[in-house]
């Protein structure tokens, strides 16, 4: 099983803890990280059959956006 | 765009060692995801772990203890050391690249490890 | 472990046929409203080439014949319309829990 705060959030616990300025939340361990460390979803073109991801969240947008538009990574939460 | 060219592989005793490199070029081993997977002879994709951009291994609990992942990063190239090895290890081993969510979107080309007397 | 399960293990289809390949998983694979459920193709020979990652996200370069849907435990596959160069192997893999799992695959051949 994955160690960090993943092991202890509940199916409906708050979102993860938010990361600084110019670190990005890592989805597969858990935490937070500076971004360059991580590869970023590439855009898509035009006219894909689903919908991007954002590449960044707002400091108002939530995490637990649905799977269509997560909005990931996700830098500088606050 | 990543490529992976993985070598090493070939025909060793029960009981013996290997150890597969797989080159990256096209980004730094000192970003992302970088993953070992096998495939036995007409069967399923096994994952066997990973390395990330901190060093940090995660392994298969059923290979953990014979196999190790490693880099480095000056020669931007990732390593499975086998130990012990076994009849049932015998596969095609790829490493392949994750993406954001780990979906694996780069892959080498294989190297066959062949365990047999 | 999550235990990925995929069915049917193999079917036979026609060029021009709608294909459906099932995976379930032995618990949810979601997370921060994501389901971390990817599907990969594989012809012999050839390393797996990712089709759909996060259930239902086009991989770049894929044909839009493919799709994915689901989200918890059970997701789906989807070709469309099939084309003779899909006849292939199909993996479903999770990568929300340590250790990462694939499915057993599904074989897809010509009838």
């Known amino acids: 099983m994955r160690r960090g705060p993943r092991s202890l959030r509940g199916r409906d616990a708050p979102a993860p803890t938010p990361c600084v300025p110019a670190e990005c939340f890592d989805l597969l361990v858990r935490h937070c990280v500076a971004c360059g460390l991580l590869r970023t979803p590439r855009p898509k073109p035009a006219g894909a059959s689903s919908p991007a991801p954002r590449t960044a969240l707002q400091p108002q947008e939530s995490v637990g956006a649905g799977a269509g538009e997560a909005a990931l990574p996700l830098p500088g939460l606050l | 765009e990543v490529q992976l060219v993985e070598s090493g592989g070939g025909l060793v005793q029960p009981g013996g060692s290997l150890r597969l490199s797989c080159a990256a070029s096209?980004?730094?081993?000192?970003?992302?995801?970088w993953n070992w997977v096998r495939q036995a002879p007409g069967k399923g994709l096994e994952w066997v772990g990973y390395?990330?951009?901190?060093?940090?291994?995660y392994y298969n609990p059923s290979l953990k203890s014979r196999f190790t992942i490693s880099r480095d990063t000056s020669k931007n190239t990732l390593y499975l050391q086998m130990n012990s090895l076994r009849a049932e290890d015998t596969a095609v081993y790829y490493c392949a690249n994750s993406n954001f969510y780990g979906a694996m979107d780069y892959w080498g080309q294989g190297t066959l490890v062949t365990v047999s007397s | 472990d999550i235990q990925m399960t995929q069915s049917p293990s193999s079917l036979s289809a026609s060029v021009g046929d709608r294909v459906t390949i099932t995976c379930r998983a032995s618990?949810?694979?979601?997370?921060?409203?994501?389901?971390?459920m990817h599907w990969y193709q594989q012809k012999p020979g050839k390393a797996p080439k990712l089709l759909i990652y996060?259930?239902?996200d086009l991989e770049s370069g894929v044909p839009s014949r493919f799709s994915g849907s689901g989200s918890g435990t059970d997701f789906t596959l989807t070709i469309s319309s099939l084309q003779p160069e899909d006849f292939a192997t199909y993996y479903c893999?999770?990568?929300?829990?340590?250790?990462?799992?694939f499915g057993q695959g599904t074989k897809v051949e010509i009838k």
């Open positions: 390395i990330n951009y901190s060093g940090t291994t």
């Open positions: 618990e949810s694979v979601d997370d921060y409203g994501i389901s971390f």
């Open positions: 893999q999770q990568t929300s829990k340590d250790p990462w799992t």
């Open positions: 996060r259930a239902s």
């Open positions: 096209g980004d730094s081993i000192t970003r992302g995801y």
